[in-house]
Amino acid sequence: WPPPGTGDIIVQAPTQVPGFLGDSVTLPCYLQVPGMEETHVSQLTWSRHGESGSMAVFHQTQGPNYSEPKRLEFVAARLGTELRDASLRMFGLRVEDEGNYTCLFVTFPQGSRSVDIWLRVLAKPQNTAEVQKVQLTGKPVPVARCVSTGGRPPAHITWHSDLGGMPNTSQAPGFLSGTVTVTSLWILVPSSQVDGKSVTCKVEHESFEKPQLLTVNLTVYYPPEVSISGYDNNWYLSQNEATLTCDARSNPEPTGYNWSTTMGPLPPFAVAQGAQLLIRPVDKPINTTFICNVTNALGARQAELTVQVKEGPPSEPSGMSSN
């Protein structure tokens, strides 16, 4: 019991202190003494909730003593000085160091004064994101994978996407005891429209100043999607040569283009040049359906286009096509 009328002394310390696995951390603890107040400190003691005995003691005449001398150190307390700073440094933080600690001052005439501090042991996770290359399955499959490895506590992963889809997130023990690896998959029904688009994995963790954003460019393998362009329904005799183009979207890229007609091989006035078909001027009307067959590693797809070359007004010297 302090003498009547004395202003009280206060032990000041943060309620929570973060430290990183394997690093050192200081548990700050100070005795705040009001201006007119007198106090005399004889011992500083640190103990851990749920454990027997004290882990560190600084005694007015005996100096410091530690339960684990290689891992603990009073930062400022020295023999022959006023014991007002009980701050304790812990080296080589381990997962099992996380918990509640009591910092206590033995004082006269006020008696013992203490404060509790929660030590959080953190581990900064390593984050990676990668594409999961897929084909047109027709059902939901993972198209991107985001992994946060060795975090403590576990990282929080979210996804940002304009493509629809949903996450599937799981946890597993990390390499270091007490750490967690979080794996999150972004799942959707693959389509050619998704190929080349991006999704963003957002990883949040106590150890980060701001969330980490990892962008993944999606890959969907699909057979060619084919169309033919270059014909405007306005081709006439005696006009310049014209070109049809076989437009193909595919992943992987097309490996071959094959032009033909519904009647079989190409007529003499049609010359294939890869994805293009050159139509030379003709002297009589034609009505031909051209076929472009495109092949890639996943298969072949084709498109058809019927071209009519008509007798027409000779005043237009522009050619058979607008090209």
Partner: antibody
Framework: EVQLVQSGSELKKPGASVKISCKTS????????MHWVRQPHGKGLEWIGG????????SYNQRFKGRVTLTVDKSTSTAYMELSSLRSEDTAVYYC?????????WGQGTLVTVSS | DIQMTQSPSAMSASVGDRVTITCKAS??????VAWYQQKPGQPPKALIY???YRYSGVPDRFSGSGSGTDFTLTISSLQAEDLAEYFC?????????FGQGTKLEIK
């Protein structure tokens, strides 16, 4: 070498007062609190109170409040304990002890006998 | 006031024996417990502070343990010169209080 040397034995009548001295040497007197503990013959130890020589702050066991006065003389590095209104149950060996949270050095003790 | 209950109050042991004295506080005192040895006709001598730390010069056969309410003083191998009375004391809160003592005799 730290030494606490107490004054000699006292025989007192009930109702009287006794003042015991504790002269210290071997350390800086003003850096440590001095406490007093008593021990009736063949019995346990009982804390009486303590005083810090610097500003004279004191803390007393309520059992002795009003009967005990602790003082110091910084010039001679001596602590004093005065106990008044003595009764027979105050018969005991009285110790001064330097305080470091626990008591690391003790005087040799002063026997106070209260008898009519 | 915090009561410190020591047991046993007296015991007899042979040289070389392992001796254990316990002290139970009536409420939580953390680790603010000291142990003293008092030989006949002498003042107490500090052995242990903060429940488990030996004073310099105290033989390492003396050890203390415990926290909260239950404390132990152990003499790992009793020597003839350990004949004495042993006291525990709490300094968690005023008034400071002592156990009633354990008188240790040598067989």
């Amino acid at each position: 070498e730290v030494q606490l040397v107490q004054s000699g034995s006292e025989l007192k009548k009930p109702g009287a007062s006794v003042k015991i001295s504790c002269k210290t040497s071997g350390y800086t007197f003003t850096e440590y609190t001095m406490h007093w503990v008593r021990q009736p013959h063949g019995k346990g130890l009982e804390w009486i109170g303590g005083i810090h020589p610097n500003q004279g702050e004191t803390s007393y066991n309520q059992r002795f409040k009003g009967r005990v006065t602790l003082t110091v003389d910084k010039s001679t590095s001596t602590a004093y304990m005065e106990l008044s209104s003595l009764r027979s149950e105050d018969t005991a060996v009285y110790y001064c002890a330097r305080w470091t949270g626990d008591f690391d050095y003790w005087g040799q003790g002063t026997l106070v006998t209260v008898s009519s | 006031d915090i009561q410190m209950t020591q047991s046993p109050s007296a015991m007899s042991a042979s040289v070389g024996d392992r001796v254990t004295i316990t002290c139970k506080a009536s409420q939580n005192v953390g680790t603010n417990v000291a142990w003293y040895q008092q030989k006949p006709g002498q003042p107490p001598k500090a052995l242990i502070y903060s429940a488990s730390y030996r004073y310099s010069g105290v033989p390492d056969r003396f050890s203390g343990s415990g926290s909260g309410t239950d404390f132990t003083l152990t003499i790992s191998s009793l020597q003839a010169e350990d004949l004495a009375e042993y006291f525990c004391q709490q300094y968690e809160s005023y008034p400071y209080t002592f156990g009633q003592g354990t008188k240790l005799e040598i067989k």
